[in-house]
């Protein structure tokens, strides 16, 4: 009874299309598949960034797979052929592994790369990234930012740098069409007459770094003798109302401070008959239904009301 064997895939390689971390893993079918003409072979692919403890595992019938990686580190991948049990009248047969690695040869020492990279997507409209120059780099060092996301034909360079003393320390991005809910890749590299500069790679999703504008039009009405209704409006811009969460800070008579989080643009507050004055501020953030993370807006302007005045208004009405 001859043992059934299958070869590993051929020409397994990791291809870098220049998308700053989005790579292609591709291969050719194994040699001598003629015996299994009526059989659909599958491939088990495992890959990871070097240093990561866990492998990502994919089983596919295709001859490629695409995914994002951290190019600050190397990438390793391995693949083998699987012959399903239907093809072998018994148990699944696996080939030996074919392996591939990829890394970008680093230039310069790590300290030369940009420090404290910070990107904020203001009001889900304007992306701004800023950084500090590497440690010990001279003023002749300049940094350049490139970015890519699925939908762009190629990586683009920043066209509107923020400069200090002629040195690029940030980038104002143009309008980024259809760029949210997908990985956004950035590379900041550098050049200097004196020494090589290390490149840095960053990946994030834009909806997770949104800093909205603060809420506006804060109002206050007395619903009943001991109930005050606080209201505000969503900030202007593209963020829909369903995507906001709010934090309110309420001060009664400069003593009691209440901080609470709400999901709508209203909050009803119980007060005592001792309450004289009421002040509140609100800030907004993108909620968990629209993003995995976010940045709180600045606080709104503080609004204060005399409770007595509110009561008079209520009685008049």
């Amino acid at each position: 009874d001859t043992e059934i064997k299958v070869n590993p895939p051929q020409d397994f390689e990791i291809v870098d299309p220049g998308y700053l971390g989005y790579l292609y893993l591709q291969w050719q079918p194994p040699l001598s598949l003629d015996n299994f003409k009526e059989c659909t072979v599958e491939y088990e692919l495992k890959y990871r960034n070097i240093g990561s403890e866990t492998w990502t595992t994919i089983i596919t019938k295709n001859l490629h797979y695409k995914d994002g990686f951290d190019l600050n580190k190397g990438i390793e991948a391995k693949i083998h052929t699987l012959l399903p049990w239907q093809c072998t009248n018994g148990s699944e047969v696996q080939s030996s592994w074919a392996e591939a690695t990829y890394w970008i040869s680093p230039q310069g020492i790590p300290e030369t790369k940009v420090q404290d990279m910070d990107c904020v997507y203001y009001n889900w409209q304007y992306l701004l990234c800023s950084w500090k120059p590497g440690i010990g780099v001279l003023l002749d060092t300049n940094y350049n930012l490139f970015y890519w996301y699925e939908g762009l034909d190629r990586a683009l360079q920043c066209v509107d740098y923020i400069k200090v003393d002629g040195q690029n320390i940030g980038c104002r991005f143009p309008y980024l069409e259809s760029s949210d809910y997908k990985d956004f890749y950035i590379c900041v590299n550098g050049s200097s007459e004196t020494k090589p500069i290390r490149s840095s790679y960053f990946t994030f999703q834009l909806q997770n770094i949104v800093k909205p504008l603060p809420p506006v039009c804060l109002t206050c009405t007395q619903e009943s003798l001991y109930e005050i209704k606080l209201k505000w409006s969503i900030p202007l811009g593209p963020i829909p109302a369903r995507c906001f969460v709010y934090e309110i800070e309420i001060r009664e008579d400069d003593t009691t401070l209440v901080t609470t989080t709400v999901e709508n643009e209203t909050y009803t507050l119980k007060i005592t008959n001792e309450t004289r004055q009421l002040c509140f501020v609100v800030r907004s953030k993108v909620n968990i239904y629209c993003s995995d993370d976010g940045i709180w807006s600045e606080w709104s302007d503080k609004q204060c009301w005399e409770v007595e005045e509110l009561l008079k208004k209520t009685l008049l009405l």
């Epitope: 299309p17 295709n62 001859l63 490629h64």
Partner: nanobody, 121 residues
Amino acid sequence: QVQLQESGGGLVQPGGSLRLSCEVSGSIFSINRMAWYRQVPEKEREMVAQITYGDTIKYYGSAKGRFTISRDSAKNAVYLQMNSLKPEDTAVYRCNIVGVLTTGHYEDSFWGQGTQVTVPS
């Protein structure tokens, strides 16, 4: 199914040029990768150049700087312009495509018969 027809091979003196063509015909829904390989008897096949996903072009080994791969999507064709040819470029050059058949659901690999390129020493 799918046929790949190569042409353009032949005998050329060292330093000369050749342009290989490969036309794809048959019931193919999408062509995702196009490549040229070469094989010398008793040796493993070797990738020369490829146009892969996202029209990314990659050259291998001594092909870098001397060979140029291009494609004509309208004609379903791939070309290999070979300049400054050397005796060590002598091989059978085979065209390969990776794509999905009109009746298929996943990628398959298709090969041409090959065209002989000879550069005498």
